[in-house]
Structures are given as structure tokens and as C-alpha cells.
Amino acid sequence: LNTTVLQGMAGQSLRVSCTYDALKHWGRRKAWCRQLGEEGPCQRVVSTHGVWLLAFLKKRNGSTVIADDTLAGTVTITLKNLQAGDAGLYQCQSLRGREAEVLQKVLVEVLEDPLDDQDAGDLWVPEESSSFEGAQVEHSTSRNQETSFPPTS
């Protein structure tokens, strides 16, 4: 499975979109986890709503938010107020019982803010809606460590 590299600015939001086959993953919850080491376990950060029909609702754990458009086959994860400690390898997962299928591997890189926090007090952040459909678009730079994006499953 290819690894997608996403770069975000410290203090900003980084949005990750993982696409999947909506029919194949019908009825399955999704999760975002952080890989502990190259071969280590993937530690759950946040997962979608426990009721699959409500997966479009945003679920939050700390500064990480997840929402799933189950009909379109896109799960969106937003890392808010990105910090240097957020850098690392993550996975989008599709959950089936106790098993987790990796949808996408994502390497998050955090870039230092060139403004160095100047004028940070003047930044305006629009109020967000509760559901996926109203999610604001976050900006990020991405590249792929291997070939195509999104990776084929």
C-alpha cells in the first residue's frame, strides 16, 4: 500500500481525505490511528460514529476530527492546530468486527510557520458545522512516496 505524504503548517489545520469503495465497505465504521514505530501497532486516535447511519456526523478526540461520507466513499480527518508532535505515520482504517483493514497510509509532516506566530491573533476561523456536508476545506500540500494517489486497495 502506498504512503501519501501530507504537509501542514504548524498552528494550522491539515485535512486528510481517504477514499474507499463505498459498496465494499458498506456498514463499516472508519478509524484514524497513529502508527507506533515501523512495525508497531496502530494506536486509535478517533473513530466515526458508533451508528453507521450517523457516520457523517463529526466525531472529535482532542484536536482530531473525523467524518465519513459513506455514500461517496470518503472519510475525512482534520488535524486542528497542528503541532510538531503530530508529525508521524498514520492510517485510515475500515473496521469490521475486531479486524481493521488499512485504507490508506499517511505520513504527516509539520512545517514551521514562516510568520513565526506573528499576527496570529488576527486570524479568523469560520464556525464549523456538525456534519461532513458542511465541513470547511482545509489546505495542505501532498506528495506520494511511491506512485499514484489515491492508492489502489
Partner: antibody
């Protein structure tokens, strides 16, 4: 007029089955999630389960206490939602309501229920 | 599972009074909360959705606020037709209802 009408309630012995119907009119039935709730005599409201709209291919979700015993289904051609109740227990005695999930203007839905039926009484007793 | 604690369980107020009902969730539920009115022998009626949005056709004297764990439902000026039981309902987990608040006229 947007309307939901439940039917099929009555007295049933423990362990037996009963099927409730919820007939919809005045709206495009297939576009909405339909839910069942219940209210035991003198008690509060309890969510039983719901069934997704046509887009969700009738996917169902249930509260833990009825999972494996109750089944929700829908017939789009007749605009009817059903609640099949098997292995009934005395604690299932309640007024059962069907309700429609609210749709946002942009097409998404919210689990707030904006149209309700009048309710049908189910009594489980020997 | 999330527990919804509604208070008070009952209250008595005069016509024209401001009435406030609170609903507390056992954990953060964002703004995933609705409020319903149920009159004796009748089905519930949706008043407020997403914690603060007034349902179409509902009088503006009804309002809702709050986020996280603490939510408030307010009737700005109580009317005789507002005699009912009011319920909050969360949808952050499995659509749990509060125990209800019975509102009566003094």
C-alpha cells in the same frame, strides 16, 4: 398533509410475535430515514431503531435491548415501515411510535424526528 | 453509553414566566441534542434540533442553547398551551433521552 399512521398493536403473550405497520403519506417516503420509538406506561421515551432512506439501501440500526429480536423493514411501493417484534417480553409493553428523520435543505439528515404517528399500544402479558 | 440528566423533573410556573430546563450529558456530545414537547396522550413534537435550531413552525418563545455537556431549553414567556412534558435527546451515541420535565401552570 404529511402524516404517519401506526397499526398492528394489541395484547400478546410473552414469547410471541407481533408486527407493527407505519403508513406514510404526503411526502416522498424513500428519501427519509424512518425510526421507531416506544414509551412504557408513565415512563419516558426510548429509541428502538431506525431504517435508512433508499440511498442507504434500508440499512438498519437498533438499540441494544431489542437487537436480535426486533427487525425494521420498509416497503417503498406502499410507503410503509414495519416493526417485526419476536420473542416479546413483558418489558416491551409500551406505546410504539414511528417517526420521520429530519432532512436538511442540502440533502443530509439529522437524527431529529419531525413527524410522528399517533402511536399504537402493545401489551405483553400472559 | 451516554446518560442524559434532565432537571428539574417537574416545575410549576405562572403564565408569562420565563421557564428554563437543563439537560446534562455524561460526556461531551458537541451540539448533538434535540428538544421535544409531549402533551398527555399525544406523540412528541420536535421543537429544537442541533441544540439551538428552531424547528419550522415552532413559536419563537422556545429556544435552546449549549454545547459539550450542558444544555438549556427556555420558554421566554410561558403560555397555557405549553403545559406538557419536555424531553432532551442526544445523538452523539445511541439516541438517548433525558427523563423529561413536566411543566405545569401555577
Amino acid at each position: 398533509e404529511v402524516q404517519l399512521v401506526e397499526s398492528g398493536g394489541g395484547l400478546v403473550q410473552p414469547g410471541r410475535s407481533l408486527r407493527l405497520s407505519c403508513t406514510a403519506s404526503g411526502f416522498t417516503f424513500g428519501e427519509y430515514t424512518m425510526s421507531w420509538f416506544r414509551q412504557a406506561p408513565g415512563k419516558g421515551l426510548e429509541w428502538v431503531g431506525f431504517i435508512g432512506s433508499k440511498a442507504y439501501a434500508g440499512t438498519t440500526e437498533y438499540t441494544a435491548s431489542v437487537k436480535g429480536r426486533f427487525t425494521i423493514s420498509r416497503d417503498g411501493s406502499k410507503s410503509i415501515a414495519y416493526l417485526q417484534m419476536n420473542s416479546l417480553k413483558t418489558e416491551d409493553t409500551a406505546v410504539y411510535y414511528c417517526a420521520r428523520g429530519k432532512r436538511y435543505s442540502y440533502g443530509g439528515w439529522v437524527p431529529a424526528f419531525d413527524v410522528w404517528g399517533q402511536g399504537t399500544m402493545v401489551t405483553v402479558s400472559s | 453509553d451516554i446518560q442524559m440528566t434532565q432537571s428539574p423533573s417537574s416545575l410549576s410556573a405562572s403564565v408569562g414566566d420565563r421557564v428554563t430546563i437543563t439537560c446534562q450529558a455524561s460526556q461531551d456530545i458537541t451540539n448533538y441534542l434535540n428538544w421535544y414537547q409531549q402533551k398527555p396522550g399525544k406523540a412528541p413534537k420536535l421543537l429544537i434540533y442541533d441544540a439551538s435550531n428552531l424547528e419550522t413552525g415552532v413559536p419563537s418563545r422556545f429556544s435552546g442553547s449549549g454545547s459539550g455537556t450542558d444544555f438549556t431549553f427556555t420558554i421566554s414567556s410561558l403560555q397555557p398551551e405549553d403545559i406538557a412534558t419536555y424531553y432532551c435527546q442526544e445523538y452523539d451515541s445511541y439516541l438517548a433521552f433525558g427523563g423529561g420535565t413536566k411543566v405545569e401552570i401555577k
